[in-house]
Interface confidence: medium
């Protein structure tokens, strides 16, 4: 799979398509996340290009939901959150690629795939077991290192890309720096390129037109295409539904991801929902902003994402007039604003930015079959294959 950003649903969809539907990925173990049972009225979000895409996750190339899948070991790790309170992150993380859900997922959905095989989530329903992902250092570690960390809860299945999954040759690990600036334009690939995104669907039709073993059409035949990429801009999974205003399917039945922004942002993927432990989740990786990490100068704002050492995180309200803002917030025009809000593209490559209690700003990076973004701000691209190897 090209090392493109998995920031768009379309892209994610493509990735998903790259591998045969529900073809387990190497080391792809999905916990608890199974594709919806085939036959369920899953609103497969078909990308305008005809690809199916799940909601936000798909939109975000399903990679946003994951805290770094790389750090599945984070489970239980406590990190400071925007609220200043230490919070234990879910221990299970799912591999971002798994989040794509095409690969390995427990057969949560009997209809979708063989019972023995990973559930056959819709292409967008990729769930990847966190266990499969290599364990990485605890959240604190990656926070300090600025490395990515797996979602404590485990990668969430990306919203299923409804596009058919095509087998995707495992690509070599591509550690490409897609850091392209806060604008999120550096996502490497157009969001539209995500599977399910209008632009991508057309540009990246199902690989070889393959469809999952179970017919996605059968599962989603009555679903209108859902262009998750439309709802997944460079921001977090929940933040937006469309990445590049691709309007191929303006009236999509599916809803795009929502965003969490503002000081009180949930960081739930504003763009990307957090991964639940052990559950399949959209492919994405979370990257917490390292303590005291600064974003750089922003007119009218002092970006100190974390409270000074020894200073407990203050409530937004209490810090509004203070000199410092809670972790994940920066002073802007005299008030504390969440990094996610001030920098919609704080997380690159379609990563979803959100604030987590006691952790601060997190970037949930997009993940797709065989490829996902990593890094504190999803600035790097790595392939699933690489990780698996």
């Amino acid at each position: 799979v090209p090392a493109r950003e998995a920031g768009s649903a379309v892209e994610a969809e493509e990735l998903v398509k790259g591998r045969p539907a529900w073809e387990p990925r190497a080391n792809d173990t999905r916990e608890e996340a199974g594709p919806p049972a085939a036959g369920e009225d899953e609103a497969s979000w078909t990308a305008p290009g005809g690809e199916l895409a799940g909601p936000e996750e798909v939109l975000q190339a399903t990679g946003t939901a994951w805290l770094e899948a790389d750090n599945p070991g984070l489970g239980g790790v406590t990190s400071e959150a925007g609220s200043g309170d230490a919070q234990a992150l879910p221990a299970t993380l799912q591999a971002p690629h798994e989040v794509l859900g095409q690969s390995v997922m427990p057969p949560a959905i009997p209809e979708a795939t063989e019972a023995s095989g990973p559930p056959s989530p819709t292409p967008g329903d990729n769930l990847s077991p966190a266990s499969e992902l290599p364990k990485e250092s605890p959240l604190e570690v990656w926070l300090n290192l600025g490395g990515s960390t797996p979602d404590p809860q485990g990668p969430e299945p990306t919203y299923p890309f409804q596009g058919t999954l095509e087998p995707q040759p495992a690509s070599d690990i591509i550690d490409i720096d897609y850091f392209q600036g806060l604008d999120g334009e550096g996502r490497g690939a157009d969001l539209g390129s995500f599977p399910g995104s209008p632009g991508t669907s057309e540009n990246h039709p199902d690989t070889e037109g393959e469809t999952p073993s179970w017919s996605l059409l059968d599962l989603y035949d009555d679903f209108t295409p859902f262009d998750e990429s439309d709802f997944y801009p460079t921001t977090s999974f929940y933040d937006d539904l469309d990445e590049e205003e691709e309007e191929e399917e303006d009236d999509k039945d599916a809803v795009g991801g929502g965003d969490l922004e503002d000081e009180n942002e949930l960081l739930v993927p504003t763009g990307k929902p957090g991964l639940g432990p052990g559950t399949g989740q959209p492919n994405s990786r979370w990257h917490a902003v390292p303590p005291q990490h600064t974003l750089g100068s922003v007119p009218g704002s002092s970006i100190a994402l974390r409270p000074r050492p020894g200073e407990p995180g203050r409530d937004l309200a209490s810090s509004e007039n203070g000199t410092e803002c809670r972790s994940g917030f920066v002073r802007h025009n005299g008030s504390c604003r969440s990094v996610c809000d001030l920098f919609p593209s704080y997380c690159h490559n379609g990563g979803q930015c959100y604030l987590v209690e006691n952790i601060g700003a997190f970037c949930r990076c997009n993940t797709q079959d065989y490829i996902w973004h990593k890094g504190m701000r999803c600035e790097s691209i790595i392939t699933d294959f690489q990780v698996m190897c």
Epitope: A37, Y159, T224, D240
Partner: antibody, heavy 116, light 111 residues
Framework: EVQLLESGGGLVQPGGSLRLSCAAS????????MSWVRQAPGKGLEWVSA????????YYADSVKGRFTISRDNSKNTLYLQMNSLRAEDTAVYYC?????????WGQGTLVTVSS | QSALTQPASVSGSPGQSITISCTGT?????????VSWYQQYAGKAPKLIIF???KRPSGVSNRFSGSKSGDTASLTISGLQAEDEADYHC???????????FGGGTKLTVL
């Protein structure tokens, strides 16, 4: 501070139309998907529709598809929901919410009553 | 789409812990870790208190915690307080026509 303020609700007869508006402030409106979620009296929440930040993508619940149209004017930081062919079952408090799946901010809601 | 299943009501005494369940299926709750919980006071708008199964938004009391097991997600409120009396709604991402699925809501009464 993120604020969402809905307006436009009211009493309308079955088959009638209403246009709800949601004025947003406190965040970069165009960067976020927005949704409409409703709650019938004494009932749970029901997602109605969502629109991407750019307005290029829209999504609807089957129950309103073809009758409701969600739109937004990013220059005015305003979200809209045009409701046509209203039915009694559309009676509910309509909330404007930020994002599409994870609603971190909600408006106070506007009541829409469809009755003859 | 049928809503997620929540008990209509739950009650507890101050200081106690209560758990509200939210049961779905493999296509929503069990399939994704995108479960969120909203608190809603009578006549007020919902407020996000838990997302991604167990994450708490900034500013939300740590007395609120979320978890998930199989098809069921749970919201636990420890050290119950009078101000916790409200309706609680769960929601989950769903890979279906309805990407956002809500539960029917649970009324929590603090005795």
């Amino acid at each position: 501070e993120v604020q969402l303020l809905e307006s436009g609700g009211g009493l309308v007869q079955p088959g009638g139309s209403l246009r709800l508006s949601c004025a947003a402030s406190g965040f970069t409106f165009s960067s976020y998907a927005m949704s409409w979620v409703r709650q019938a009296p004494g009932k749970g929440l029901e997602w109605v529709s969502a629109i991407s930040g750019s307005g290029g993508s829209t999504y609807y619940a089957d129950s309103v598809k073809g009758r409701f149209t969600i739109s937004r004017d990013n220059s005015k930081n305003t979200l809209y929901l045009q409701m046509n062919s209203l039915r009694a079952e559309d009676t509910a408090v309509y909330y404007c919410a930020k994002k599409w799946n994870l609603f971190d901010y909600w408006g106070q809601g506007t009541l829409v009553t469809v009755s003859s | 789409q049928s809503a997620l299943t929540q008990p209509a009501s739950v009650s507890g005494s101050p200081g106690q812990s209560i758990t509200i369940s939210c049961t779905g299926t493999s296509t929503d709750v069990n399939g994704y870790n995108y479960v969120s919980w909203y608190q809603q006071y009578a006549g007020k708008a919902p407020k996000l208190i838990i997302f991604d199964v167990s994450k708490r938004p900034s500013g939300v009391s740590n007395r609120f915690s979320g978890s998930k097991s199989g098809d069921t997600a749970s919201l636990t409120i420890s050290g119950l307080q009078a101000e916790d009396e409200a309706d609680y709604h769960c929601s989950s991402y769903r890979r279906l026509r309805l990407p956002v699925l809500f539960g029917g809501g649970t009324k929590l009464t603090v005795l």
